[in-house]
C-alpha cells in the first residue's frame, strides 16, 4: 500500500506525480524534481521534499537553552543533492561551485568553500529542539495535557514513535519540543526526527505536505493551540566546524 489505490494519490506527499504503472498496475508515486519513487505510507525525506519544492513553479527557566553547537537553518532554501535513498549528500554545491557540508537534515555545518571541500560523512542530527510561541489564550495550557497532545500529534500525524519525543517544555507562551534519535535507536521503518520536524514546521506555517488531509488543527482540551512563530535548533552527533570569523 505505497499509495491510495482508488484515485492514485500519495497521502503523505502532495509534491508527487502518481500513476498506476507499478507492478501489477499498482499506484506508484514519484517525487517532483527528482523522479525518485516514494513510499506513500510514511513521510518523504526532507531532501526529496526540498528538491521538489525548488522544482515547483515559482509564483525562560524551565526552557532549554540550546548549546553553542546548535544550528539554525539560516541559509534558507536551496536545491539539494540527494542520494538514491533520498538522504542529503554530505557535500552540497550551488551552480557557482560554492560547496559546504550539511548534516542529515540538510543544514550547513561548515564554512562555504570551493569544489575541493571534502565532507567525509553525513553527520547525523540526533537532537532537534522545536521552539514555538503560541498565540495568547485566556489561561495557560495544562502542561501534562499539552505534553500528551503533542506526543499524540507526532505519533498519529507524523508517525514518530513517542519514545523519540524526549520532552515537552512549557513556559507560557513558549513551548519547546525536544526530539532525540541516535543512530543506534533508529530501527528500519522508523520515521526520522528530521523529517517529522520538517513536516511539523510546514504544517505550522499552513503549508501542509499531506494530500487531502486537513491542515493542522491542534487542540488541548478543546482549546485551539495556534502557533505564532517557530524556531528550530539542530544538534549533531559531531559538533559543526565553523571558522572563528563566523562566530564574531
Amino acid at each position: 500500500h505505497t499509495a491510495a489505490q482508488d484515485n492514485c494519490t500519495c497521502p503523505t506527499n502532495k509534491m508527487t506525480v502518481c500513476s498506476p504503472d507499478g507492478p501489477g498496475g499498482r499506484c506508484q508515486c514519484r517525487a517532483l524534481g527528482s523522479g525518485v519513487a516514494v513510499d506513500c505510507s510514511t513521510l518523504t525525506s526532507k531532501c526529496l521534499l526540498l528538491k521538489a519544492r525548488m522544482s515547483a513553479p515559482k509564483n525562560a527557566r524551565t526552557l532549554v537553552r540550546p548549546n553553542e553547537h546548535a544550528l539554525v537553518d539560516n541559509d534558507g532554501l536551496y536545491d539539494p543533492d540527494c542520494d538514491p535513498e533520498g538522504r542529503f549528500k554530505a557535500r552540497q554545491c550551488n551552480q557557482t561551485s560554492v560547496c559546504w557540508c550539511v548534516n542529515s537534515v540538510g543544514v550547513r555545518r561548515t564554512d562555504k568553500g570551493d569544489l575541493s571541500l571534502r565532507c567525509d560523512e553525513l553527520v547525523r542530527t540526533h537532537h532537534i529542539l522545536i521552539d514555538l510561541r503560541h498565540r495568547p489564550t485566556a489561561s495557560a495550557f495544562n502542561h501534562s495535557d499539552l505534553d500528551a497532545e503533542l506526543r499524540r500529534l507526532f505519533r498519529e500525524r507524523y508517525r514518530l514513535h513517542p519514545k523519540f519525543v524526549a520532552a515537552v517544555h512549557y513556559e507560557q507562551p513558549t513551548i519547546q519540543i525536544e526530539l532525540r534519535q541516535n543512530t543506534s535507536q533508529k530501527a528500519a521503518g522508523d520515521v526520522d526526527i528530521g523529517d517529522a520536524a520538517y513536516y511539523f514546521e510546514r504544517d505550522v506555517k499552513g503549508e501542509s505536505l499531506f494530500q487531502g488531509r486537513g491542515g493542522l488543527d491542534l487542540r488541548v482540551r478543546g482549546e485551539p493551540l495556534q502557533v505564532e512563530r517557530t524556531l528550530i535548533y539542530y544538534l549533531d552527533e559531531i559538533p559543526p566546524k565553523f571558522s572563528m570569523k563566523r562566530l564574531t
Epitope: H1, E149, E156, V191
Partner: antibody, heavy 120, light 110 residues
Framework: QEQLKESGGGLVQPGGSLKLSCKAS????????VSWVRQAPGKGLEWIAY????????YYATWVNGRFTISSHNAQNTLYLQLNSLTAADTATYFC?????????????WGPGTLVTVSS | DVVMTQTPASVEVAVGGTVTIKCQAS??????LAWYQQKPGQPPKQLIY???TLASGVSSRFSGSGYGAEFTLTISGVECADAATYYC????????????FGGGSEVVVK
C-alpha cells in the same frame, strides 16, 4: 514470557468505587503503551483509556467524562484503573491490553480480565 | 471521531468453507486496522495488524485486506476451532474517540 494479569475486580454497590490493577511481567513497561478495555456480558469490546507509561501520557474515550482514571507505577510494572461513581452499566470484564510497541495502536498482548459487578 | 461498523453481526459457515467479514471506518484510516478473535471466556487474540499483516503464530487461513475506509477479514478452509466472535479495531488514533472497536461478528461453524 510476556504476560498481563488483572486483579481487583469484585462486587461493588452502585455509586461505589474500585481500583483495578494490571501487573505486567516479561517485558519493560516503559517501551509500550497500555489500554484498559471492557466487555459487558454478551456485548462487544469497549475501549476505556490508554497510557504511555514512560511519559505518563493518558488518553480517554469520550464517554468516560472523568469517572475513570488510568495510571501506572513504572517501577512495579503495574497499571491501574480507578473506577468511581459506578452504575449497573459498568458491570463488565475489564481487560488490560498492551500495544505492539509500534506507532499504531494495535494490541498484541491481553490479560485474562477481571470481572466487576455493580449491584445492590 | 472515527466510528467502526462491522458486518455481518452473525454468519454461519460450513467446515471447509470461506467466510468474509467487512469493516467500514467513518473516515480514512489508511492501513491502520487490526482484527481480533475472541472465544467465550477468553480475552481477545490479535490475528492481523496493519490491515493485512498476520500476527505471530496465526494460521495463514486468516487474511486481511483493504485500505482507507473499507476492510475485509477472510477465513478460508474454516475449521471448528474458528467458531468465535471477530472484532475490527481502528489503530490510527485515540484522540476524540468513543470506541475504536467494531461491534463484532459472530462466526458459527456448522
Amino acid at each position: 514470557q510476556e504476560q498481563l494479569k488483572e486483579s481487583g475486580g469484585g462486587l461493588v454497590q452502585p455509586g461505589g468505587s474500585l481500583k483495578l490493577s494490571c501487573k505486567a511481567s516479561g517485558f519493560d513497561f516503559n517501551n509500550y503503551g497500555v489500554s484498559w478495555v471492557r466487555q459487558a456480558p454478551g456485548k462487544g469490546l469497549e475501549w476505556i483509556a490508554y497510557i504511555y507509561p514512560a511519559f505518563h501520557n493518558t488518553y480517554y474515550a469520550t464517554w468516560v467524562n472523568g469517572r475513570f482514571t488510568i495510571s501506572s507505577h513504572n517501577a512495579q510494572n503495574t497499571l491501574y484503573l480507578q473506577l468511581n461513581s459506578l452504575t449497573a452499566a459498568d458491570t463488565a470484564t475489564y481487560f488490560c491490553a498492551r500495544d505492539a510497541g509500534s506507532v499504531d495502536y494495535n494490541f498484541n498482548l491481553w490479560g485474562p480480565g477481571t470481572l466487576v459487578t455493580v449491584s445492590s | 471521531d472515527v466510528v467502526m461498523t462491522q458486518t455481518p453481526a452473525s454468519v454461519e459457515v460450513a467446515v471447509g468453507g470461506t467466510v468474509t467479514i467487512k469493516c467500514q471506518a467513518s473516515k480514512n484510516i489508511d492501513s491502520n486496522l487490526a482484527w481480533y478473535q475472541q472465544k467465550p471466556g477468553q480475552p481477545p487474540k490479535q490475528l492481523i495488524y496493519a490491515a493485512s499483516t498476520l500476527a505471530s503464530g496465526v494460521s495463514s487461513r486468516f487474511s486481511g485486506s483493504g485500505y482507507g475506509a473499507e476492510f475485509t477479514l477472510t477465513i478460508s478452509g474454516v475449521e471448528c476451532a474458528d467458531a468465535a466472535t471477530y472484532y475490527c479495531q481502528q489503530a490510527l488514533t485515540i484522540g476524540n474517540v468513543d470506541n475504536p472497536f467494531g461491534g463484532g461478528s459472530e462466526v458459527v461453524v456448522k
